[in-house]
């Protein structure tokens, strides 16, 4: 009897997760009758994986058929394995007793460890734009991969980038693992149709990595240019003075007319035009009728653009001095002020 | 703890059959098999036949190939021997027994049923 | 077929003396490195209790007393010290093939 080794051949396994496992066993010998049993760990605290003699273990299946004469072959197979079924395997041979079988031989143990896809990059960026010149921080999560070893790349439009920093949680051991990457983007002008990506390698991609991707649309405020000018008269006593707005992004803005400092008219833009860089140019004018201004006009165009604090471009009309007669030439000059 | 469980006594006219039954506890019934072995009154044992309730293998003794059938129903656990066309010499105490090495021995015994044929 | 042949038919010994009874096969029940005898003990309105298998490994809780030998065709189940609770019938069973029992031998107090 003391002759019976258990022989456990394979010190590890690994195994991708959904996939099954097969952990293989074999006794030297059919002596002591009893029965075969897989625990997961050692010790008091060890996990009852199979009972040959008796339970349910429906994700068990034993390799061979038990029931056959001569059988020493224990192996099992372990169905859909998750990363939380990483640990040590030990088969161990029970001997008969009365009333309970008693535990008579162990084998070296077989670890498995379970290779687990990380889930796909999330990439986010900040709660609020920012507008060029400013850095703004994403951050990159995935989760639920083993082994640890991963590894973690930026890109902006294909670019490397190269100032971020990356944390695999936890430290130690566990079953699964998180990784979490957080970069710093200078954006520009141009970033508009910029794409942020964060690209994750792992053994389980055979090569093919994950990527989460931010537009930078989604981050980027563009404040637009304002500028005044005034057209030929286009009738007697009427000024046309177009405000041009342009390269603004998003697209959300509100334009204000004020006569001197009164609102005259406001108006949303809507039929605006698009940039090759993603900006958008939106034009507005407004028809003056000189002959009813005894005074100079001061013509303001005031442009509030995705709820930020309003800009505004000035441009002053110079009324002439001699009396107004119907029909009557109305000369105007203009100057133009920028106001913030 | 293993425990097997038989029916009771029969009492059988010659020409009649017999279905004994073993309700089986304590294990994992389909593991191991099952063997059925008589006892004539003041007689020795004698081996009728086997039954893997896994996959229903039978290996029957060729004296009662012809009328035994052993079967078992795996929801309860329970295996049935039956024995057609009785004699009077089929008197005996039927005993089930489970083979717990499956080295086609007989580690834990049933208690036994008496079938008498008298007519 | 392999037969199984008991001797004697039955046997008185003295109590605290060795007791031998011996079981002969009609061919080599040896197979895979196994001699596959059993050994059996029945007392009066009980079912047969497995002592022995595979020749000579005693079963759970088996007494020390009982030892069982042999290979190939020939085997014996020795008591070394007859106790009065080992009154009983004893059978010899194989199973190199479908199993047999041999005949039994009955065992009694001299």
């Known amino acids: 009897e003391e002759g019976l080794q258990v022989i456990q051949p394979d010190k590890s396994v690994s195994v991708a997760a959904g996939e099954s496992a097969i952990l293989h066993c074999t006794a030297t010998s059919l002596i002591p009758v009893g029965p075969i049993q897989w625990f997961r760990g050692a010790g008091p605290g060890r996990e009852l994986i199979y009972n040959q003699k008796e339970g349910h273990f429906p994700r068990v299946t034993t390799v061979s058929d038990l029931t056959k004469r001569n059988n020493m072959d224990f192996s099992i197979r372990i169905g859909n394995i998750t990363p939380a079924d990483a640990g040590t395997y030990y088969c161990v041979k029970f001997r008969k007793g009365s009333p309970d079988d008693v535990e008579f031989k162990s084998g070296a143990g077989t670890e498995l460890s379970v290779r687990a896809k990380p889930s796909a990059p999330v990439v986010s960026g900040p709660a609020a734009r920012a507008t060029p010149q400013h850095t703004v921080s994403f951050t990159c999560e995935s989760h639920g991969f083993s082994p640890r070893d991963i590894t973690l790349k930026w890109f902006k439009n294909g670019n490397e980038l190269s100032d971020f920093q990356t944390n695999v949680d936890p430290v130690g051991e566990s079953v699964s693992y998180s990784i979490h990457s957080t970069a710093k983007v200078v954006l520009t002008r141009e970033d508009v149709h910029s794409q942020v990506i964060c690209e994750v390698a792992h053994v389980t991609l055979q090569g093919d990595p994950l990527r989460g991707t931010a537009n930078l649309s989604e981050t980027i405020r563009v404040p637009p240019t304002l500028e005044v000018t005034q057209q030929p008269v286009r009738a007697e006593n009427q000024v046309n003075v177009t405000c041009q707005v342009r390269k603004f992004y998003p697209q959300r803005l509100q334009l204000t007319w004020l006569e001197n400092g009164n609102v005259s008219r406001t108006e949303t833009a809507s039929t605006v035009t698009e940039n090759k860089d993603g900006t958008y140019n939106w034009m507005s004018w407004l028809l003056v009728n000189v002959s009813a201004h005894r005074d100079d006009v001061k013509l303001t165009c005031q442009v509030e653009h995705d709820g930020q604090p309003a800009v505004s471009k000035s441009h002053d009309l110079k009324v002439s001095a001699h009396p107004k007669e119907q029909g009557s030439n109305t000369a105007a000059e203009n100057t133009g002020s920028n106001e913030r | 703890q293993v425990q097997l469980v038989q029916s009771g006594a029969e009492v059988k006219k010659p020409g009649a059959s017999v279905k004994v039954s073993c309700k089986a506890s304590g294990y994992t019934f389909t593991n191991y098999w099952i063997n059925w072995v008589r006892q004539a009154p003041g007689q020795g044992l004698e081996w009728i036949a086997m039954i893997d309730p896994s996959d229903s293998e039978t290996h029957y003794n060729q004296i009662f190939k012809d009328r035994a059938t052993l079967t078992t129903d795996t929801s309860t656990s329970t295996a049935y021997m039956e024995l057609r066309s009785l004699r009077s010499d089929d008197t005996a105490v039927y005993y089930c027994?489970?083979?717990?090495?499956?080295?086609?021995?007989?580690?834990?015994w049933g208690r036994g049923t008496l079938v008498t044929v008298s007519s | 077929d392999i037969v199984l042949t008991q001797s004697p038919d039955s046997l008185a010994v003295s109590l605290g003396e060795r007791a031998t009874i011996n079981c002969r096969a009609s061919q080599s029940v040896r197979s895979s490195g196994y001699n596959w005898i059993f050994w059996y003990q029945q007392k009066p309105g009980q079912p047969p209790k497995l002592l022995i298998y595979l020749a000579s490994n005693r079963d759970s809780g088996v007494p020390d007393r009982f030892s069982g030998s042999g290979s190939g065709t020939d085997f014996t189940l020795t008591i070394s010290s007859l106790q009065a609770e080992d009154v009983a019938v004893y059978y010899c069973q194989h199973s190199r093939e479908l199993p047999t029992f041999g005949q039994g031998t009955k065992l009694e107090i001299k």
């Open positions: 027994a489970m083979d717990y090495g499956s080295l086609y021995a007989m580690d834990y």
